[in-house]
């Protein structure tokens, strides 16, 4: 603790100019005083002055008023300093004596004699407020006041809590009265250290350094830190936590970037041709007879069907066709002979059959021939046998189809198993698909074909939903969720009326 | 009982950074009750704040350094790092991290042991 | 900027009190601290808040700040006393550090 006692002598009236033991001064009593501020005695009694002592220069002779003064030689009020915690109790002896000597440091002159002195043993509580009384004895009178304040920095009913303002990292407060910390505006906590952030801004998701600030945390966003960052390159989805990519309804995989409903959203399909909501876009095009392209954009010539029979060749008109038949053939498609077996109409080695009594034919053709008159070379690959993509050669009088990877037979309608030869490791279930073999793996692998064991179980929070079977090791946030039928979406929490397909990858 | 471990570097070229990494073992650099500062002390001299930061990121630098300074943290690792560019011969000193204190009023209870940076060709 | 100035040395006998000052202005509205500094050591923290001693700091070392001065007092100095000492306080958001003084017990 710090205070400081503060004693204010206002008057003192020695009208005879007296001392204490009846003498008189000559030629007036030059006065000085001498205090001693000591603990409480029931008795004063002489000993050290254990509160502090100070004494004055001479500030009157015989009867004065004493002024103020706030510095050098003669302050007054007079300054007892103490640096402890004050008890609330004291003892004041006021001794005023006369001086033959010095004016300023009359205590050390010799010959000093007592005029008067008076004792003050009470409580006195810290306060601004002086405490004003006036003694007499039968010579004298003397007015005075005093008060114990707290040295700067220095607060409580004991001058006892040390507090200085600062407005740093380390607090920004004033000091109450009492000593404890008002801190200043925007900021708080025990050392009013901690600034309060802009209101509304996310408890965990966000932070300040200075008041009325919202800094966010790593995968949070928005003005008050309550928005998630989804996962980079997420297009049509959101999130609930950050970097999760949920997608929305109608759209699938890791990025929501797959159109499960391309066919409604975007009618792709042109000419009236049927869109169906698969392949590897996302959508197939069914096309109407006259119709080719991905999206049945190009319309085919009205010849593409070569319907211009028995060597007739075939014109494109605005709206139809015209056939140009050879000469003994007639009809819009010269499907009407004028010639009979008589004039040899079979070529390549065809038989000649009459019909109806001899005013037509007809030609049975040898091997790898066809046409009215055995006319066109058989191109077997014309019926496209070849299934999942293969492809087909002429070879003489067979064709063969060449079989993508993963295919074989005759028509390469017999899919070979990638999983056959087992690739998953540690378990995992394979899964055959277009590009190849793909593993979901069991809990604590991961990697192509579950080789790597992981320390962290991604699934062991449980972050599918609707009965979905939780894998992982197939994708970068080392979890997957298989949806059961009629649920979609990264952790399948959307339920859409669409067929199961692979597993949506979380 | 908390320790602070300086690492880096003990010899920088003029005009390059120096630059040094404290580790925290026993205590959490995120508690809110502490800023964690970095001092020097040229051979032969006192000592020198360069800064200090906050678990959050805040920093706070000594003006004559502010221009070549960079003070961060790393909660996950318990580290803070000091950046200290384009030096010359008067940045050799020795380098100290510590814990300053907010119930102390700031002062430093613990100290590293220093790590001596020599900025020489 | 902000300065605070110690005396280069101080000497003191065995058992004597040794007063270290530091000055700075309106020093006494800071708080101060005081750290001691043996040769090759780290410093060690010896007094906060003026007045206030770190647990495992012995009872001989005490300090006090007012106006512009603040003061360090090590009564019944003995030879294990003998080291640098440096005040610090804050200015603003700056650590300031005072020259250092250094002790000898004779």
């Known amino acids: 603790g710090s205070g400081i006692f503060q004693l204010r002598l206002q008057e003192f009236v020695n009208q005879r100019g007296m001392l204490a033991n009846g003498q008189s001064c000559e030629p007036g009593c030059r006065t000085f005083f001498r205090i001693c501020l000591k603990h409480f005695q029931a008795t004063f009694s002489e000993g050290p002055c254990t509160f502090g002592n100070v004494s004055t220069p001479v500030l009157g002779t015989n009867s004065f008023v004493v002024r103020d003064k706030n510095s050098g030689s003669g302050r007054n009020p007079l300054q007892l300093p103490f640096n402890f915690t004050w008890p609330g109790t004291f003892s004041l002896n006021i001794q005023a004596w006369h001086t033959p000597g010095d004016d300023l440091r009359p205590e050390t002159s010799p010959g000093n004699s007592l005029i008067s002195q008076i004792i003050i043993q009470g409580s006195l509580a810290v306060g601004k407020i002086w405490r004003t009384d006036e003694q007499n004895d039968t010579l004298t009178r003397l007015s005075y006041s005093y008060r114990v304040i707290c040295s700067d920095n220095y607060y409580g009913e004991s001058c006892s809590r040390l507090c200085k303002k600062r407005d740093d990292h380390f607090g920004h407060y004033e000091c109450q009265p009492d000593g404890s910390l008002s801190c200043l505006p925007g900021w708080t906590g025990k050392y009013c250290d901690q600034p309060i952030c802009l209101s509304g801004c996310h408890e965990q998701n966000g932070y300040c350094s200075k008041p009325d600030e919202c800094i966010c945390r790593p995968g949070w966003q928005g003005r008050l830190c309550n928005e998630c960052i989804p996962h980079n390159g997420c297009r049509h989805g959101t999130c609930s936590i950050p970097w999760q990519c949920a997608c929305d309804e109608g759209w699938g995989g890791l990025f929501c970037d797959q159109d499960l409903n391309y066919c409604t959203h975007h009618s792709p399909c042109k000419n009236g041709s049927t869109c169906s909501n698969s392949g590897p876009k996302g959508y197939t095009c069914t096309c109407l007879p006259g119709y080719t392209g991905e999206h049945c954009e190009l319309g085919l010539s009205k010849c593409a069907s070569n319907p211009c029979r028995n060597g007739g060749s075939c014109k494109d008109q605005e709206n139809s066709y015209h056939c140009l038949c050879p000469p003994g053939y007639y009809g819009q498609h010269c499907e009407h002979s004028t010639l009979t077996c008589a004039d040899s109409p079979c070529f390549n080695g065809g038989s000649c059959r009459e019909r109806n009594q001899g005013s037509s034919y007809a030609c049975e053709c040898p091997p790898n021939f066809t046409g009215s008159n055995c006319e066109k070379k058989v191109d077997r690959c014309t019926s496209n046998p070849c299934a999942n993509g293969g492809q087909c050669q002429n070879r003489g009088p067979s064709r063969t189809c060449r079989c993508r990877p993963g295919f074989t037979g005759t028509h390469c309608e017999l899919h070979i198993s990638d999983c056959a030869r087992s690739p998953c490791a540690h378990g995992g279930t394979c899964h055959d698909l277009e590009n190849g073999p793909v593993c979901t793996c069991p809990a604590g692998f991961s990697g192509r074909r579950c080789e790597v064991r992981i320390t962290h179980d991604a699934c062991a929070s449980g972050p599918c939903f609707n009965g979905a079977t939780c894998y992982t090791g197939l994708s970068p946030n080392n979890f997957v969720c298989n949806c059961p039928y009629g649920f979609v979406g990264s952790r399948c929490e959307f339920p859409v009326g669409l067929p199961p397909s692979f597993p949506w990858v979380a | 009982e908390v320790q602070l471990q300086e690492s880096g570097p003990g010899l920088v070229k003029p005009s390059e950074t120096l630059s040094l990494t404290c580790t925290v073992s026993g205590g959490s650099i995120s508690s809110s009750s502490y800023y964690w500062g970095w001092i020097r002390q040229p051979p032969g001299k006192g000592l020198e704040w360069i800064g200090d930061?906050?678990?959050?990121?805040?920093?706070y630098y000594n003006p004559s350094l502010k221009s070549r300074v960079t003070i961060s943290v790393d909660t996950s690792k318990n580290q803070f790092s000091l950046k200290l560019s384009s030096v010359t011969a008067a940045d050799t000193a020795v380098y100290y991290c510590?814990?300053?204190?907010?119930?102390?009023?700031?002062?430093?209870?613990?100290w590293g042991q220093g790590t001596l940076v020599t900025v020489s060709s | 900027s902000y300065e605070l100035t110690q005396p280069p040395s101080v000497s003191v006998s065995p058992g004597q009190t040794a007063s270290i000052t530091c000055s700075g202005q309106?020093?006494?509205?800071?708080?101060v601290s005081w750290y001691q500094q043996k040769p090759g050591q780290s410093p060690v923290l010896v007094i906060y808040?003026?007045?206030k001693r770190p647990s495992g700091i012995p009872e001989r070392f005490s300090g006090s700040n007012s106006g512009d001065t603040a003061t360090l007092t090590i009564s019944g100095t003995q030879p294990m006393d003998e080291a640098d000492y440096y005040c610090q306080a804050w200015d603003r958001d700056v650590g300031v550090f005072g020259s250092g003084t250094k002790v000898t017990v004779l």
């Open positions: 808040e003026d007045s």
């Open positions: 510590a814990r300053e204190d907010v119930i102390l009023r700031g002062g430093s209870d613990y």
């Open positions: 309106r020093l006494g509205d800071k708080y």
């Open positions: 930061i906050y678990y959050t990121g805040s920093t």
